[in-house]
């Protein structure tokens, strides 16, 4: 009915799903038929599929709807030409002519939009040991209009962490600990600059890689050893020791000794596997009294770090397998015999 | 028209700080970083560090972290650079510059310049 | 930190006659964020070319700029003796933002 709908104006911002414009064609056939029908389609000036048409069969009203979000910045003016058609063919000899087109100028004004991340997340991956001030990721965003952004941390608990406002640049500010906690987990934030201070926000994760510098402990409290005064015969405890450091693919490799020489005549060290080690006695003669004995667990890493534990072990006097002590003598009772 | 005036020079004397000013007309402050550039005839142009006014975001450079505090008052759209325990070294020229709006990084105007001479 | 290295460091040039000063770079710099300031002895440093080959406002067309990567360069087509100053490159591709020691340009 009509080539020509003129300009139409529309801010980027229009839901998607709104009509923006409604056509109409005529068509002499028989109603409600294939041959009087009509459909629309979009010929030109929307190779983005932006938007769509949709038919009302009963009226062969089109409906020009937003199909996809519209952006000023890659077309701010459109020039777009649909086609009514028959669903079915039309009989031989006869063609669509002119006034099966029509146009109309789609105008897209400019809405101020936040910056926008070229990731959701980034990511990077350091060394825990890294020097303070050293460069340990870098995010960018950008701003649909061409405006600068002004970046910022959010969420940096721990203080590690300094952002480069301008560039986006990251850099560590104290020391980095992978024991405390990997990924490290930061939100940056992107300001656009120029006014009307939008903003996104995007993740940071800062995966630490391990170094070396946990020593050997025991993986649990040993207090309580005891063993029964006096000994029948020597006797032995089993002992496990763990660090805080990471173990890929293999468990820990400790070694075991004891952590002084004195030590030697009365105990000797043997190792079980690479956590496990077992205490024992070299002889019976022990007093009825606590006995510390220091071990020396090394961890064979790069650089080696060495842990001195103290295993405290109590010969008592038992009564039906339990230390026994005389009343007012409580404090400390060893729980765990041998 | 867009205008950076800075306050005079200053003579101090080493151990003291200065603290320095770089008033901003014409254009609207919070908008834009301010930056602070020194200039001495061994090391030419040096970059100290930016302010954004538009909500405090600042950034250093490594070497002068420590010595240098950057600070903005919105209501009197100035930008203020303290310097601290000064040494014969910090003497130069130090210029405050306007950062582009848009995404070059250029300093489109600059001040006067503001020279500190550090001296017993 | 990247380093801006210009060459030469003193030229001098007729008028009229074609200059070319060169900026090179440590490592590798977006053509976005290189930029040309001039300065003038007592004068503050002026923008000058912004984003390698973009004249700022004011700039006569005898200027030029060029380049990519690590090697850039300005260029005066025909030299007038208001051109004669001290020429800055600078990038702002990483922090700190750096500039060269500078080109000084003299009126032979």
């Known amino acids: 009915e009509k080539s020509d709908y003129g300009n139409l104006t529309l801010a980027e911002d229009t839901n998607i799903g709104s009509t923006i414009l409604t056509i109409q064609a005529t068509d002499a056939d028989e109603p409600f038929t294939g041959s009087s029908k009509i459909l629309y389609h979009i010929i030109k000036g929307d190779s983005e599929g932006r938007l769509g048409v949709d038919t009302d069969p009963h009226t062969n009203t089109g409906y020009v709807i937003i199909k996809k979000p519209l952006d000023f910045e890659t077309a701010a003016v459109s020039n777009i030409v649909f086609k009514a058609e028959n669903p079915e063919p039309l009989v031989f000899g006869v063609k669509y002519n002119a006034s099966s087109f029509a146009k109309f100028t789609l105008i897209v004004t400019d809405v101020n939009e936040a910056p926008q991340f070229s990731q959701h997340v980034f990511q990077a991956k350091v060394s825990e040991d890294v020097a303070i001030g050293t460069k340990v990721g870098n995010v960018t965003a950008k701003d649909p209009e061409g405006l600068d952004i002004s970046y910022s941390l959010r969420g940096d608990t721990r203080g590690w962490l300094k952002i480069d406002h301008v560039t986006g640049e990251i850099f560590s500010v104290a020391p980095l600990d992978r024991e405390a906690g990997s990924p490290y987990r930061v939100q940056v934030v992107a300001t656009e600059v120029g006014g009307s201070s939008l903003s996104s926000v995007s993740e940071f994760h800062l995966i630490l890689m391990d170094v070396n510098d946990n020593p050997p402990r025991l993986a649990k409290d040993y207090t309580g050893l005891f063993f029964c005064h006096p000994l029948s015969a020597p006797g032995s405890l089993i002992f496990e020791a763990t660090d805080d450091d990471q173990h890929l693919f293999r468990g820990p490799h400790f070694t075991f000794s004891l952590g002084s020489g004195s030590l030697q005549n009365d105990w000797e060290v043997s190792k079980i596997n690479g956590t496990h080690a077992r205490l024992s006695t070299r002889h019976t003669e022990f007093e009825e009294r606590e006995y510390v004995v220091l071990i020396r667990i090394n961890d064979g890493g790069r650089p080696p770090l060495e842990g001195i534990v103290s295993l405290p072990v109590t010969f008592c006097s038992c009564v039906e397998g339990s230390c026994f002590r005389p009343a007012g003598h409580q404090t400390g009772i060893p729980t765990v015999g041998m | 028209q867009v205008q950076l005036q800075q306050s005079g020079a200053e003579l101090v004397k080493p151990g003291a700080s200065v603290r320095m000013s770089c008033k901003s007309s014409g254009y609207t402050f919070t908008s834009y970083n301010i930056h602070w550039v020194r200039q001495t005839p061994g090391q030419g142009l040096e970059w100290i560090g930016a302010i954004y006014p538009g909500n405090g975001d600042n950034s250093y450079n490594q070497k002068f972290r420590g010595k240098v505090t950057l600070t903005a008052d919105k209501s009197s759209s100035t930008a203020y650079m303290q310097l601290n325990s000064l040494t014969s070294e910090d003497s130069a020229v130090y210029y405050c510059?306007?950062?582009?709006?848009?995404?070059?990084?250029?300093?489109?105007?600059w001040g006067q310049g503001t020279t500190v001479t550090v001296s017993s | 930190d990247i380093v801006l290295t210009q060459s030469p460091a003193i030229m001098s040039a007729s008028l009229g006659e074609r200059v070319t000063m060169t900026c090179t770079a440590s490592s590798s710099v977006s053509s976005s964020y290189l930029h040309w300031y001039q300065q003038k002895p007592g004068s503050s440093p002026k923008l000058w070319i912004y984003?390698?080959?973009n004249l700022a406002s004011g700039v006569p067309a005898r200027f030029s700029g060029s380049g990519s990567g690590t090697s850039y360069s300005l260029t005066i087509s025909s030299m007038a003796a208001e051109d004669a100053a001290t020429y800055y490159c600078h990038q702002y591709l990483r922090s700190p933002p750096t500039f060269g020691s500078g080109t000084k340009l003299e009126i032979k």
């Open positions: 984003s390698t080959s």
């Open positions: 510059a306007r950062q582009t709006a848009r995404t070059t990084r250029a300093m489109d105007y």
